[in-house]
Amino acid sequence: ALPAKPENISCVYYYRKNLTCTWSPGKETSYTQYTVKRTYAFGEKHDNCTTNSSTSENRASCSFFLPRITIPDNYTIEVEAENGDGVIKSHMTYWRLENIAKTEPPKIFRVKPVLGIKRMIQIEWIKPELAPVSSDLKYTLRFRTVNSTSWMEVNFAKNRKDKNQTYNLTGLQPFTEYVIALRCAVKESKFWSDWSQEKMGMTEEEAPCGLELWRVLKPAEADGRRPVRLLWKKARGAPVLEKTLGYNIWYYPESNTNLTETMNTTNQQLELHLGGESFWVSMISYNSLGKSPVATLRIPAIQEKSFQCIEVMQACVAEDQLVVKWQSSALDVNTWMIEWFPDVDSEPTTLSWESVSQATNWTIQQDKLKPFWCYNISVYPMLHDKVGEPYSIQAYAKEGVPSEGPETKVENIGVKTVTITWKEIPKSERKGIICNYTIFYQAEGGKGFSKTVNSSILQYGLESLKRKTSYIVQVMASTSAGGTNGTSINFKTLSFSVFE
């Protein structure tokens, strides 16, 4: 049979290296030789390229070399397939060399901030040595912060006569390290060079860009003063490397600004002992370049009634995230403060907090929370300077089976009845929210029975038992991940009752 017609011809001019054309050879059953027929020099010259490889993959490509390649130029390329049965030709294809030229990547040799110009870095590079002198080059510059995985891109062109191979990348974050890569192409070409080697550069440092401020209110002490733990952190979106030398804090009673107290610290929290009235707390962070904007927080008076608007709240795990959703009755509240900490018996030391705006849900990556730990999550509504009543729930980022079953006891043994009681599993052993308990019981040599009850029940009465019979009983506590049995207990029903 004749060879299959070569299809999908594609050509690339690897600038000043070779012009390579490839094609789909079709299913060949016998040895097929391919000849690429070319006209070039704007139709004034022609020549052939014959594949000489014995492997079928390599036979579907052929290259022309300098000096018989000039640019600009128009080519026609036709591929002829020949086997013992005859010759078949492809369609004639037409190529403008400028449209298919591919150069080496440029070389970035310097990425630096420009003195006194904020949030900008200048990229300097060397044009690919092998690039057409007669063509302008277009560039794509891609950049990302060091700890990010997603690239941003910017496109620009350079005139071939432009000696200045630099680009000023603006609108960046201050004092942030960026990864830069550059690629180029002949302006008319559809083929981009590979990306250059990546180069790092950092924007200039600035004064701190701001703080987020929060508080934990504690019960008033005997003297009427109330401990308030102030917490703060860099504002969201602040540069990772942003340096802070310290913090200035000042606070005063809402009713009297003259009674302002000030303090300095280098810590990221501070315990204040305030009177029972309402207070304003303000603070700034500073470094060698200046001060951040002021962050301000109102501390309510002890007897002040806070508003309530969260009606229902639930937590669920979805796609490696813990999602907390709530419903609010106050449409004008659109900022919320989320607090979360592990539910341990001791005083919580690791309180985390984060604000949410324009949403009534909050998500956190599962791996930011410890698996099998119970977390207390509170959501505070915030309206202007007022903080509302929090709504709190408990949730696990990842549930496991309890590490031990319930400790079980048998009480009130009768002729045909018994009461099974059990204790809650300690928090540290639950590994998840206990959703139910299952009581398994079985007469000696008899059939087993089970009964499931909800997690609020810690005792259960078994009835219709056989008199004077030995039973074995155990209770299983279950989370969404599965259940764990407690130790099994034996008991024997009575032979008669005093009431008989």
């Epitope: 290296k17 020099a41 004034e44 010259k45 300098l66 000096p67 390649i69 640019i71 040595e129 092998l130």
Partner: antibody
Framework: QVQLVQSGAEVKKPGASVKVSCKAS????????MNWVRQAPGQGLEWMGL????????DYNPQFQDRVTITADESTSTAYMELSSLRSEDTAVYYC??????????????WGQGTLVTVSS | DIQMTQSPSSLSASVGDRVTITCQAS??????VAWYQQKPGKAPKLLIY???TEAQGVPSRFSGSGSGTDFTLTISSLQPEDFATYYC?????????FGGGTKVEIK
């Protein structure tokens, strides 16, 4: 900047061989064709052949086909022209010359300083 | 092989003169002609390629024209540094051949 530096003058006996070198600098050696041209004393220019250092492809003037060998060493960015079976009429200045223009194939844009080869018994 | 016939083989001219050198190819070579200037003891220097494109850094007084088989190099106003030998060369394909040269001397 682009430079081609050739080896020094040679004096050879008839029947011997000579190998002239041309060291390139200031550009990507594999990206450009290297030609060899000779000029006998008081005479015109005569093209001997070329090499593409990228793939080692050569093209010779049929007049020299049997006697000339052009090679290139990418590691040292050096091209070589060897002429064998020398005779007195091979006495000439031998030039290496690089092509230079995308739109002008076989043009000789940058030249070496020349190497005088004298063939004399 | 393509033969390149150059004329005149020499000419005398004065500074400021317009000088024309011609070159004839033995067959149609479209516009694949280059012109070189060579001074005594020096390597040739490319002036024009593709019959009329000036090489980088070449003064505008040098111009080329022609296509097919007949080509011309013109120096519009001869300068003292232009006294040299000029060669045409076809760059249509291998083997490359040069014209015999035209020596431009001071009158």
């Amino acid at each position: 900047q682009v430079q081609l530096v050739q080896s020094g003058a040679e004096v050879k006996k008839p029947g011997a061989s000579v190998k002239v070198s041309c060291k390139a600098s200031g550009y990507t050696f594999t990206g450009y064709i290297m030609n060899w041209v000779r000029q006998a004393p008081g005479q015109g220019l005569e093209w001997m052949g070329l090499i593409n250092p990228y793939n080692g492809g050569t093209d010779y003037n049929p007049q020299f086909q049997d006697r000339v060998t052009i090679t290139a060493d990418e590691s040292t960015s050096t091209a070589y022209m060897e002429l064998s079976s020398l005779r007195s009429e091979d006495t000439a200045v031998y030039y290496c010359a690089r092509d230079g223009y995308d739109d002008g194939p076989y043009t000789l844009e940058t030249w070496g300083q020349g190497t005088l080869v004298t063939v004399s018994s | 092989d393509i033969q390149m016939t150059q004329s005149p083989s020499s000419l005398s001219a004065s500074v400021g003169d317009r000088v024309t050198i011609t070159c004839q190819a033995s067959e149609d070579i479209y516009s694949f002609v280059a012109w070189y200037q060579q001074k005594p003891g020096k390597a040739p220097k490319l002036l024009i390629y593709n019959a009329q494109t000036e090489a980088q850094g070449v003064p505008s007084r040098f111009s080329g024209s022609g296509s097919g088989t007949d080509f011309t190099l013109t120096i519009s106003s001869l300068q003292p540094e232009d006294f040299a030998t000029y060669y045409c060369q076809h760059h249509y394909d291998s083997p490359l051949t040069f014209g015999g040269g035209t020596k431009v001397e001071i009158k």
